[in-house]
């Protein structure tokens, strides 16, 4: 598993560097998670042909993965910092159950899957410090999450592989959009 942000050898070699600003820390954290997703996608793509599959729509119907929309205020047109921040945090909290699903889906990258899950928690905490209106954030209902997880785990092997691929792809896209938006804040 890659080394978490702030713990790489360069940090040890340069102890007199300025501490990271909150924005820099968030940026670094997202890039770290994206690196982890790349490693997981590599294993998924090596294991099955999902990455070239055109049958994604079949599995996508089952999933309600968070996506950025115009109304979320994260795109350049109609950008709204607070609305966007609420969307990013809400989306990450919604992704948590899907990251839980990923935990038993990897053989050689088991640690990496756990690192992505834990690093996402850290990212949520960083972002919460930045948000002004936590009351606008709706957390996922655990009962709904439990039935979703049960449903995903009961799928046949092909659908589970497709679900894994779709979660990783959607999470990557969501984080990339978040990164672009956060760089405007």
């Amino acid at each position: 598993a890659p080394v978490p942000p702030g713990e790489d050898s360069k940090d040890v070699a340069a102890p007199h560097r300025q501490p990271l600003t909150s924005s820099e820390r968030i940026d670094k954290q997202i890039r770290y998670i994206l690196d982890g997703i790349s490693a997981l996608r590599k294993e998924t793509c090596n294991k099955s042909n999902m990455c070239e599959s055109s049958k994604e729509a079949l599995a996508e119907n089952n999933l309600n993965l968070p996506k950025m929309a115009e109304k979320d205020g994260c795109f350049q047109s109609g950008f709204n910092e607070e609305t966007c921040l609420v969307k990013i945090i809400t989306g990450l909290l919604e992704f948590e159950v899907y990251l839980e699903y990923l935990q038993n889906r990897f053989e050689s990258s088991e640690e990496q899957a756990r690192a992505v899950q834990m690093s996402t928690k850290v990212l949520i905490q960083f972002l919460q410090k930045k948000a002004k209106n936590l009351d606008a954030i709706t957390t996922p209902d655990p009962t709904t999450n439990a039935s979703l997880l049960t449903k995903l785990q009961a799928q046949n092997q092909w659908l589970q592989d497709m679900t894994t691929h779709l979660i990783l792809r959607s999470f990557k896209e969501f984080l990339q959009s978040s990164l672009r938006a956060l760089r405007q804040m």
């Epitope: 909290l93 839980e100 936590l134 009351d135 954030i137 957390t139 655990p142 009962t143 439990a146 979703l148």
Partner: nanobody, 118 residues
Framework: QVQLVESGGGLVQAGGSLRLSCAAS????????MGWFRQPPGKVREFVGR???????NYADSVKGRFTISRDNNNNTVYLQMNRLKPEDTAVYYC????????????WGQGTQVTVSS
């Protein structure tokens, strides 16, 4: 499995306040979400509010602005502060814990009775 024990219930007049506590014991207490529910007499159990692992709180519309959930991680306790109580808040109040993001509420307390008289 986490054991949850509620306390702080009782009889209070309309407009008054009560603070319920939910103390957890058992394995390491760092649940994904802690929730409060209530069951009014002759009705089904309903959601009151929840606090997730990162401290974000959500409430049922019927209690918004009157009830506040907080937690003390050092004492493994979650609280429900109830202000401006109404007779329709009369119920048995339960706390519940969801240990992981996909586990649902997998631990429940026995409940504590709250009666609001008019």
């Amino acid at each position: 499995q986490v054991q949850l024990v509620e306390s702080g219930g009782g009889l209070v007049q309309a407009g008054g306040s009560l603070r319920l506590s939910c103390a957890a014991s058992g394995r390491t207490f760092s649940p994904y979400t802690m929730g409060w529910f209530r069951q009014p007499p002759g009705k089904v159990r309903e959601f009151v509010g929840r606090i997730n692992w990162s401290g974000i709180r959500n409430y049922a519309d019927s209690v918004k602005g009157r009830f506040t959930i907080s937690r003390d991680n050092n004492n493994n306790t979650v609280y429900l502060q109830m202000n401006r109580l109404k007779p329709e808040d009369t119920a048995v109040y339960y706390c519940a814990a969801a240990s992981q993001s996909g586990s649902g509420y997998d631990s429940w307390g026995q409940g504590t009775q709250v009666t609001v008289s008019s």
